[in-house]
Interface confidence: low
């Protein structure tokens, strides 16, 4: 049975399509192709003469056309109006007519989309956002990034206008994005640039450090005050309620007894119009709570050099405390290879080496006072056997 | 549900030539383009061919160029690889693979079980 | 000689996370998408990521996969025993108009 297949089915405006013959009978005469999904004259495109191997234009000619001796008609430079069904009529030596229909559909070039929006500052737990994807264009599939992942399940994002508008109910700070709108048809596709929220929020609850309480007499008292906000929080400091100074941070230089009572940081966003305090209680004292004995474990105590990696443990049940760790009475990290992790909890050494070896212990302490693990011994061998393949290492 | 069953398979001397067929079911085949892709022993996945829905398009690896021929049988519903001038270096597993996106964005969704061709004197 | 190139091994313990990089060029990775394949021992290759990001139905949400300019990433997280497999990256080729794939990452559970 005769056939024709387009290639591609769908193209791009401004290409070719090659609308190909299958099973083409032996005995004929000539052939012709005509616009649309029957035989019309008024549509005729070209019609070939096999014995003069000719090519007479028809009505329908727009000069892009070409038709080959296997029946296959070749269109260039395509637009949207040639998108539809081509009909192919074939005169065979028993005068028996043949036909078959085929079609494509034509697509533009998509352009870069660009992205609209209702509100670009919006607050946080308040505002709604509605992102448009720009510009509307026919047959084109719209689809949406954020955070260059595709549209995360949830109740706060809604799709409407054919996917081109995504609205963001109730916009929170992790909703800045970046966001980017893709569209698509079957012969291209273009992606937005980025476009960024600047969610308006907090100030939140304050954060005061460090977070010692206890201090000793003649020691400076630096107090930091820090509120996440968007824009950032403007800050101001009370002693025992009584207005100090506004700033975010807070110096006392040789304090006394007398500096004891309750901090407290106020941080304000002008933008929300939302306030938060914290209160901190300071006590200066000559008494000094005692921090205990830390204890030290390690992963392994005999390890393999340049293979085996080790990772050491202080533990401690004080809060407050700080952590520092010692090898052969050095502080550490000493290389690239020791990492300080978890509040310093934790030293990991990546590859072992030979002149790790030796006696470590970690020590926590406050502002007040210290305390020392048991030191604890740490072993690196070599293997001296040659690798299996007898290559050298490395 | 979609299968796709390979055969054909078997041992050919160096030079000689094979025919591998793939039948589908389970799914609309003249819609999808199809693939050969082929694994040696203990080595990795190497694409060899892909032929479009209505068989207008094909594209060969080179390293297959003029040796090995794709075809399909819509009718049939089965995708073929016309294997010629074997090399011991086409000792393989061949799997043929459905791509759903129409080559707009190439991947294979389904996979056959494999059918092994060992090219030997 | 791969035309992407994968690490050939990767491991990780039960419940982490464990990433397999696919280096291309701009004739793949850059301007196609990217598809990954498991393959378990003795198996079929399966597909676990297409254009780039995106999960068949049926693929665990611990698989996703990420591309930045000619390159691409799988990241498996809460690794499990059954994760043990090769892993391969593919992308359509320009240059050469056809699909290649990556060497292959044989990721081992330990």
């Known amino acids: 049975q005769l056939t024709t297949e387009s290639m591609p089915f769908n193209v791009a405006e401004g290409k070719e399509v090659l609308l190909l013959v299958h099973n083409l009978p032996q005995q004929l005469f000539g052939y012709s192709w005509y616009k649309g999904e029957r035989v019309d004259g008024n549509r005729q495109i070209v019609g070939y003469a096999i014995g003069t191997q000719q090519a007479t234009p028809g009505p329908a000619n727009s000069g892009r056309e070409t038709i080959y001796p296997n029946a296959s008609l070749l269109i260039q430079n395509v637009t949207q109006n040639d998108t539809g069904f081509y009909t192919l009529q074939v005169i065979k030596s028993d005068l028996v007519n043949e036909e078959a229909t085929g079609q494509f559909h034509v697509y533009p070039e998509l352009p870069k989309p660009s992205i609209s929006s209702n509100n670009s500052n919006p607050v946080e737990d308040k505002d709604a956002v509605a992102f448009t994807c720009e510009p509307e264009t026919q047959d084109t599939t719209y689809l949406w990034w954020i955070n260059n992942q595709s549209l995360p399940v949830s109740p706060r994002l809604q799709l409407s206008n054919g996917n081109r508008t995504l609205t963001l109910l109730s916009v929170t700070r992790n909703d800045t994005g970046p966001y980017e709108c893709e569209i698509q048809n079957p012969v291209s596709a273009n992606r937005s640039d980025p476009v960024t929220l600047n969610v308006t929020y907090g100030p939140d609850t304050p954060t005061i450090s460090p977070s010692d309480t206890y201090y000793r007499p003649g020691a400076n008292l630096s107090l930091s005050c820090y509120a996440a906000s968007n824009p950032p929080a403007q800050y101001s400091w009370l002693i025992n309620g009584t207005f100090q100074q506004s700033t975010q941070e807070l110096f006392i230089p040789n304090i006394t007894v007398n500096n004891s009572g309750s901090y407290t940081c106020h941080a304000n966003n002008s933008v929300t119009g939302c306030n938060r305090t914290t209160v901190k209680t300071i006590i200066v004292t000559e008494l000094s709570p005692v921090v205990a004995k830390p204890q030290i474990k390690a992963s392994k105590t005999t390890v393999t050099g340049d293979k085996d990696s080790v990772n050491l443990t202080c533990s401690t049940n004080d809060t407050g405390i700080s952590i520092r760790w010692f090898f052969k009475n050095q502080s550490l990290p000493s290389s690239e290879r020791m990492k300080l992790s978890q509040g310093n909890t934790t030293l990991s050494i990546n590859p072992v080496k030979r002149e790790d070896a030796g006696t470590y212990w970690c020590e926590v302490f406050n502002p007040i006072s210290k305390n020392q693990s048991d030191p604890i011994m740490l072993n690196v061998n070599y293997n001296a056997l040659p690798q299996e393949n007898g290559l050298s290492p490395g | 549900e979609v299968q796709l069953l390979e055969s054909g398979g078997g041992l050919v001397q160096p030079g000689g030539s094979l025919r591998l067929s793939c039948a589908a079911s389970?799914?609309?085949?003249?819609?999808?383009?199809m693939s050969w892709v082929r694994q040696a022993p203990g080595k990795g996945l190497e694409w060899v061919s892909v032929?479009?829905?209505?068989?207008?398009?094909?594209y060969y690896a080179d390293s297959v160029k003029g040796r090995l021929t794709i075809s399909r049988d819509n009718s049939k519903n089965t995708l073929y690889l016309q294997m010629n001038s074997l090399r011991a270096e086409d000792t393989a597993v061949y799997y043929c693979?459905?791509?759903?996106?129409?080559?707009?964005?190439?991947?294979?969704?389904?996979w056959g079980q494999g059918t092994l061709v060992t090219v030997s004197s | 000689q791969s035309v992407l190139t994968q690490p050939p091994s990767a491991s990780g313990t039960p419940g982490q996370r464990v990433t397999i990089s696919c280096s291309g060029s701009?004739?793949?990775?850059?301007?196609?998408?990217v598809s990954w394949y498991q393959q378990l021992p003795g198996t079929a290759p399966k597909l676990l990521i297409y254009?780039?990001?995106r999960r068949p139905s049926g693929v665990p949400d611990r698989f996703s996969g990420s591309k930045s300019g000619t390159s691409a990433s799988l990241a498996i997280s809460g690794l499990r025993s059954e994760d043990e497999a090769d892993y391969y990256c593919?992308?359509?080729?320009?240059?050469?108009?056809?699909?290649?794939f990556g060497g292959g990452t044989k990721l081992t559970v330990l």
């Open positions: 693979a459905r791509d759903p996106t129409k080559g707009y964005a190439p991947t294979f969704d389904y």
């Open positions: 389970g799914f609309t085949f003249s819609n999808y383009a």
């Open positions: 032929i479009s829905h209505g068989g207008g398009s094909i």
């Open positions: 701009s004739s793949n990775i850059g301007n196609n998408y």
């Open positions: 254009a780039d990001s």
């Open positions: 593919g992308a359509w080729d320009l240059s050469l108009n056809g699909y290649v």
